[in-house]
């Protein structure tokens, strides 16, 4: 029997300071180019080496960005979302959603080191 895959979804506020070359990440998504089926949200597709986001360490590829400086990213065209980031100023507050994959063992099986039982 295979284990099922679950996801642990958490939200975090990440405050970044724009570096010499910017914030240091790429995004995908938007109402005109959905990255996830039936979801027009904005997702992080790349963290640039030595950029502000990479040096901070909290933002991860695959994270969904919910808001920038308190402004909701729902129902935005891709380019409008990009422009929002580019005009966000020196100190940028991101509300992000992390989606962590959790592998559960088969039902009835207790993994090694499980303290219960």
């Amino acid at each position: 029997m295979n284990g099922r895959v679950d996801y642990l979804v958490t939200e975090e506020e990440i405050n970044l300071t724009r570096g010499p070359s910017g914030l240091g990440f790429n995004i995908v998504g938007g109402t005109d180019q959905q990255y996830v089926s039936n979801d027009s949200g904005i997702y992080v597709s790349r963290i640039k080496e030595n950029g502000a986001a990479a040096l901070d360490g909290r933002l991860q590829e695959g994270d969904k960005i919910l808001s920038v400086n308190g402004q909701d990213l729902k129902n935005l065209l891709h380019q409008d979302a990009v422009d929002l980031f580019r005009n966000a100023g020196y100190a940028v507050s991101l509300r992000v959603q992390h989606r962590l994959q959790v592998q559960n063992g088969p039902i009835g099986h207790r993994g090694e080191g499980d303290p219960s039982g």
Epitope: S21, G22, V28, Y43, V44
Partner: nanobody, 127 residues
Framework: HVQLVESGGGLVQAGASLRLSCAAS????????MAWFRQAPGKEREFVAE????????WYSDSVKGRFTISRDNAKNTVYLQMNNLKPEDTAVYYC?????????????????????WGQGTQVTVS
């Protein structure tokens, strides 16, 4: 490794048009973001326009928006910069640049440090 060769520069009068070409070799052209930068005498190199084929995006600097058009022909491994209504302040050496096309759009203004490959440049002089 990508090699880039620009052509099409020259001396023109204000209000005229020019089309620059940049021929690429040595890589899978469609997998690169292509851009034009320029450097005027005594000034820093500045971004002009960028075309990312895989991400369907085109960017322009405010100073050329509405006058310049970047386009590419993947079959010919060439990127173009059509420059209309040229002004004396457009006088510069124009450089073609290429960078591996990553997924998605950068949230940062295009920056020359992002680009790995550069041509030798072509001179545009507007009198």
């Amino acid at each position: 490794h990508v090699q880039l060769v620009e052509s099409g520069g020259g001396l023109v009068q204000a209000g005229a048009s020019l089309r620059l070409s940049c021929a690429a070799s040595g890589g899978t052209f469609s997998s690169y973001a292509m851009a034009w930068f320029r450097q005027a005498p005594g000034k820093e190199r500045e971004f002009v326009a960028e075309d990312s084929w895989s991400n369907h995006r085109v960017w322009y600097s405010d100073s050329v928006k509405g006058r310049f058009t970047i386009s590419r022909d993947n079959a010919k491994n060439t990127v173009y910069l059509q420059m209309n209504n040229l002004k004396p302040e457009d006088t510069a050496v124009y450089y073609c640049a290429a960078d591996r096309d990553y997924s998605g759009s950068t949230v940062d203004p295009p920056n020359q440090s992002e680009y790995d490959y550069w041509g030798q440049g072509t001179q545009v002089t507007v009198s």
